[in-house]
Interface confidence: low
């Protein structure tokens, strides 16, 4: 199984996308784990929602976020506030009962900001993870590509804002033309302050991101 090398700048976010056969992995949860040495078990960092149908919800563990688009066959992992201690070999896994199938091996390299002379030893931020949890040793290959589509929540918010502005402009135009009869209620349209916020909450899970 080929290893994908990804580089990120310390302090910034690194986005990892592992693609898989959506039909083959139907109903399976995904996990992101850190390899303990060349032959060691894979230390679980974060896994997708326990209910597979809710896998699109973002799950967070420390500075790592995971979300799975089960229809598109893409699981996305975001390593936020990348630190020197985050460098290492990781795996995207597909969980099947008590076994885990490796979707992709990812070598994360952290580049130090030349302006930041902070001692690398101080940059270690431990993540809550499970090192007991050895990845199943048998591997199967899968496609891998980088994707950088905006999250659904952002698109929804943008659409909501644009629609609200359009509705507001329409209403102002109608009022300006004097066609608004006294006592006629103003159309609320989408309440972006509430519904979109709630949608963001749903998409990021109760803990947010």
């Amino acid at each position: 199984l080929n290893t994908t090398v990804l580089q990120g700048m310390a302090g910034q976010s690194l986005r990892v996308s592992c693609t898989y056969d959506a039909l083959k992995h139907w109903g399976r949860r995904k996990a992101w784990c850190r390899q303990l040495g060349e032959e060691g078990p894979c230390q679980r960092v974060v896994s997708t929602h326990g209910v597979w149908l809710l896998a699109f919800l973002k799950k967070r563990n420390g500075s790592t976020v995971i979300a799975d688009d089960t229809l598109a066959g893409t699981v996305t992992i975001t390593l936020k506030n990348l630190q020197a201690g985050d460098a290492g070999l990781y795996q995207c896994q597909s969980l099947r009962g008590r076994e885990a199938e490796v979707l992709q091996k990812v070598l994360v390299e952290v580049l130090e900001d030349p302006l930041d002379d902070q001692d690398a030893g101080d940059l270690w931020v431990p993540e809550e993870s499970s090192s007991f949890e050895g990845a199943q040793v048998e591997h199967s290959t899968s496609r891998n590509q980088e994707t950088s589509f905006p999250p659904t929540s952002i698109l929804l918010l943008l659409a909501c804002v644009l629609l609200s502005k359009f509705l507001a402009a329409s209403i102002l135009w109608a009022v300006a033309r004097g066609r608004q009869k006294p006592g006629t209620p103003v159309v609320r349209g989408l309440d972006c302050g509430q519904d979109a916020g709630h949608q963001l909450q749903i998409l990021t899970g109760p803990g947010g991101t």
């Epitope: 078990p41 969980l95 008590r98 993540e127 090192s131 007991f132 949890e133 199943q136 040793v137």
Partner: antibody
């Protein structure tokens, strides 16, 4: 169902070596890591190391480095743990334990190794 | 001396609830998931709880686990005489690069 069956009890003299076996059944042997844990009489659990039956790769606890060797025979789905230069304080029950996505989910019944002159 | 600290013994009457604590540090419990194991007399350990609070199939919901900071707790409700055993917590220690266990807690059902 998953089973880990270990070899019978052994009595060894100080300085000798012992090789404990752990036969796996009910699952894909090469698909899971095998750990070895020991327990001295009346004492707690002590981790010795893990073993990758697929590649033969190992990681040993620092305390046992140089004295322990973990191997396997995939043709008979069996893992082995050999401990050399035995001392009296190596007297213990030695367990093999499987680890997949769930840690140490199945254990062998244990093998008592007695080191006595 | 074990890396993880457990009380040597706890006791309670049948039907009661008991908790067993497991204290560690930022390099083990604070940095990883905790598992709990039950060892009945003269038998091999058995997995009770993994990932801090998950039960393997076949483990009754009388057993529960939790974690906060660098400490973990095993809870047992509706105590039965068959629960008399030694209980061990375990996790990974990133400093030692090893699996570590607590010293074990002997549960006595009065």
């Amino acid at each position: 169902q998953v089973q880990l069956v270990q070899s019978r009890a052994e009595v060894k003299k100080p300085g000798a070596s012992v090789k404990v076996s752990c036969k796996a059944s009910g699952y894909t042997f090469t698909g899971y890591y095998m750990h070895w844990v020991r327990q001295a009489p009346g004492q707690g659990l002590e981790w010795m190391g893990w073993f990758n039956p697929n590649s033969g790769g190992t990681k040993y606890a620092q305390k046992f480095q140089g004295r322990v060797t973990m191997t396997r025979d995939t043709s008979i789905n069996t893992a082995y743990m050999e401990l050399s230069s035995l001392r009296s304080d190596d007297t213990a029950v030695y367990y093999c334990a499987r680890t997949g996505v769930i840690p140490f989910d199945y254990w062998g019944q244990g093998t008592l190794v007695t080191v006595s002159s | 001396q074990s890396v993880l600290t457990q009380p040597p013994s706890v006791s309670a009457a049948p039907g009661q609830k008991v908790t067993i604590s497991c204290s560690g540090s930022s390099s083990n419990i604070g940095n990883d998931y905790v598992s709990w194991y039950q060892q009945l007399p003269e038998t091999a350990p058995k997995l009770l709880i993994y990932d801090n609070n998950k039960r393997p199939s076949g483990i009754p919901d009388r057993f529960s686990g939790s974690k906060s900071g660098t400490s973990a707790t095993l809870g047992i409700t509706g105590l039965q005489t068959g629960d008399e055993a030694d209980y061990y917590c375990g996790t990974w220690d990133s400093s030692l690069s090893a699996v570590v266990f607590g010293g074990g807690t002997k549960l006595t059902v009065l």
